[in-house]
């Protein structure tokens, strides 16, 4: 396969800042199915973090797919201020506080942070780099914001996101949420190029999901993560498919529409399934 | 106050097996994380296994991975090591430790006795 | 593996004198959150180890203050100011940074 012409990919100038799914489906790819029809859906977008348009073929695909561009922003977007700004309310934690610590299969182990439902803290454990599940953060504090109670036993403000009093909009914060890339399924395509724990310098390639492109990266020897692809070829083969995004002349952002097989998505989708 | 009681120690041949017990009682054992840390007769601490707090993950260095599993039983308040394809450098006493909120040992069992002899 | 060296490997100290047990480790114990997670534990004679410090300098409940820990990075010191005779034991250090985690071959403190 060819790298199909790199200069499809759009890059913004500003870095989103991290992203805290409402529901796991959120993060689905849209899948136009098998079917040939051609119906006008809508899909969440984890690269533009808004709701958007494509062409759905009838027939299977994923939950990541509205009939409305307002169920969508209902079910993936928090543009609802008063369930986002801390209430007087409970609030729930997110699915994910009450999973099992997993350091997944991997071996190259580093320090991360879980939610633990028995003692209702966030405790210290070890990740081996891989897979794993989303009650996993890089920091006690990040933990603590998603899923610890507050003190007066009301859930923090776990979504990080404060009413901007100049236009009313919702101005995400991020130091407050876990980032799109500790999804710890098989997308392993988004996440980062990690060299991992060695001393070794070997020549691999890593997706980088933010530019649609397979990049070079130096690899230790150990460790690191899935993302990692002894050839450009073979980066692109397993990632790129899908996962590009492109911007067509109406403003609209559409997916390629190949209906090669996509082991990606539907290990991706898979998982968090399984891990929800 | 926390108390963990192993068993199981024996004595047995290379290449045997030999399944070791920890009994937790004074704190809610479902809640930690917990591991197997053995000592050899020359005295030196050696890390074991490690399980999650409900049962389904397990940590091993590599000198007893695929030999030990690691497994627990929160109803119980029990936790197993399964020891096989054992070798005389796997003497040793063995302790069972509790993992505190810092992934740290905190408290140590009176320990067990596993001596691999022919 | 994460080498830990402790020195001396014997000790003997007069009671009511002070007393100094160093660890070092083969690489930086400071982890990527920030901790440093270098541990003590105490094995007095016919029993089995107790932990006395974690996180380098703090105490575990009932461990008197006469103990303390310092240090960073690779080099750790844990200090006993005026040595009592139920102190006598093996001192181990411990790090719970990096995987496995791994001991240190022991101080014996012995009373003079």
């Known amino acids: 396969d060819s790298e199909e012409d790199e200069e499809h990919t759009i890059i913004t100038d500003t870095e989103l800042p991290p992203l805290k799914l409402m529901h796991s489906f959120c993060a689905f790819k849209a899948d136009d199915g098998p079917c040939k029809a051609i119906m006008k859906r809508f899909f969440f977008n984890i690269f533009t973090r808004q709701c958007e348009e494509f062409i759905y073929g009838g027939c299977e695909g994923n939950q990541n797919r509205f009939e409305s561009l307002e169920e969508c922003k209902k079910m993936c977007t928090r543009d609802n201020a008063n369930r986002i700004i801390k209430t007087t309310l409970q609030q729930e934690k997110p699915d994910f506080c009450f999973l099992e610590e997993d350091p997944g299969i991997c071996r190259g182990y580093i320090t991360r942070y879980f939610y633990n439902n028995q003692t209702k803290q966030c405790e210290r454990f070890k990740y081996g780099g891989c897979l794993g599940n989303m009650n996993n953060f890089e920091t006690l504090e990040e933990c603590k914001n998603i899923c610890e109670d507050g003190p007066n036993g009301f859930q923090v403000d776990n979504y990080g996101t404060q009413l901007n009093a100049v236009n009313n909009s919702l101005t995400p914060q991020s130091t407050k949420v876990p980032s799109l890339f500790e999804f710890h399924g098989p997308s392993w395509c988004l996440t980062p190029a990690d060299r991992g724990l060695c001393r070794a310098n070997e020549n691999r390639f890593y997706y980088n999901s933010v530019i649609g492109k397979c990049r070079p990266f130096k690899y230790s020897g150990c460790g690191g993560n899935e993302n990692n692809f002894t050839s450009k070829q073979e980066c692109l083969r397993a990632c790129k498919k899908g996962f590009i995004q492109r911007i067509s002349k109406g403003g609209l952002i559409k997916t390629k529409r190949k209906r090669k097989k996509q082991r990606v998505k539907i290990a991706y989708e898979e998982i968090f399934v399984k891990n929800m | 106050e926390v108390h963990l009681v192993e068993s199981g120690g024996d004595l047995v041949k290379p290449g045997g097996s030999l399944k070791l017990s920890c009994a937790a009682s004074?704190?809610?054992?479902?809640?930690?994380?917990m591991s197997w840390v053995r000592q050899t007769p020359d005295k030196r601490l050696e890390w074991v296994a490690t399980i999650t707090t409900g049962g389904s993950y397990t940590y091993y260095p590599d000198s007893v991975k695929g030999r030990f599993t690691i497994s627990r039983d929160n109803a119980k308040n029990t936790l197993y090591l399964q020891m096989s394809s054992l070798k005389s450098e796997d003497t040793a006493m063995y302790y069972c430790?509790?993992?505190?909120?810092?992934?740290?040992?905190?408290?140590w069992g009176q320990g067990t006795t596993v001596t691999v002899s022919s | 593996d994460v080498v830990m060296t402790q020195t001396p490997l014997t000790l003997s100290v007069t009671i009511g004198q002070p007393a100094s047990i160093s660890c070092k480790s083969s690489?930086?114990?400071?982890?990527?959150?920030?901790?440093?997670?270098l541990n003590w534990l105490l094995q007095r004679p016919g029993q089995s180890p107790k932990r006395l410090i974690y996180l380098v300098s703090k105490l575990d409940s009932g461990v008197p203050d006469r103990f303390t820990g310092s240090g960073s990075g690779t080099d750790f010191t844990l200090k006993i100011s005026r040595v009592e005779a139920e102190d006598l034991g093996v001192y181990y250090c411990?790090?719970?940074?990096?995987?496995?985690?791994?001991f240190g071959s022991g101080t014996k403190l012995e009373i003079k």
């Open positions: 411990w790090q719970g940074t990096h995987f496995p985690f791994t």
């Open positions: 004074g704190f809610t054992f479902s809640s930690y994380a």
């Open positions: 430790a509790r993992q505190d909120g810092n992934f740290l040992m905190d408290y």
């Open positions: 690489q930086s114990l400071l982890d990527s959150d920030g901790k440093t997670y």
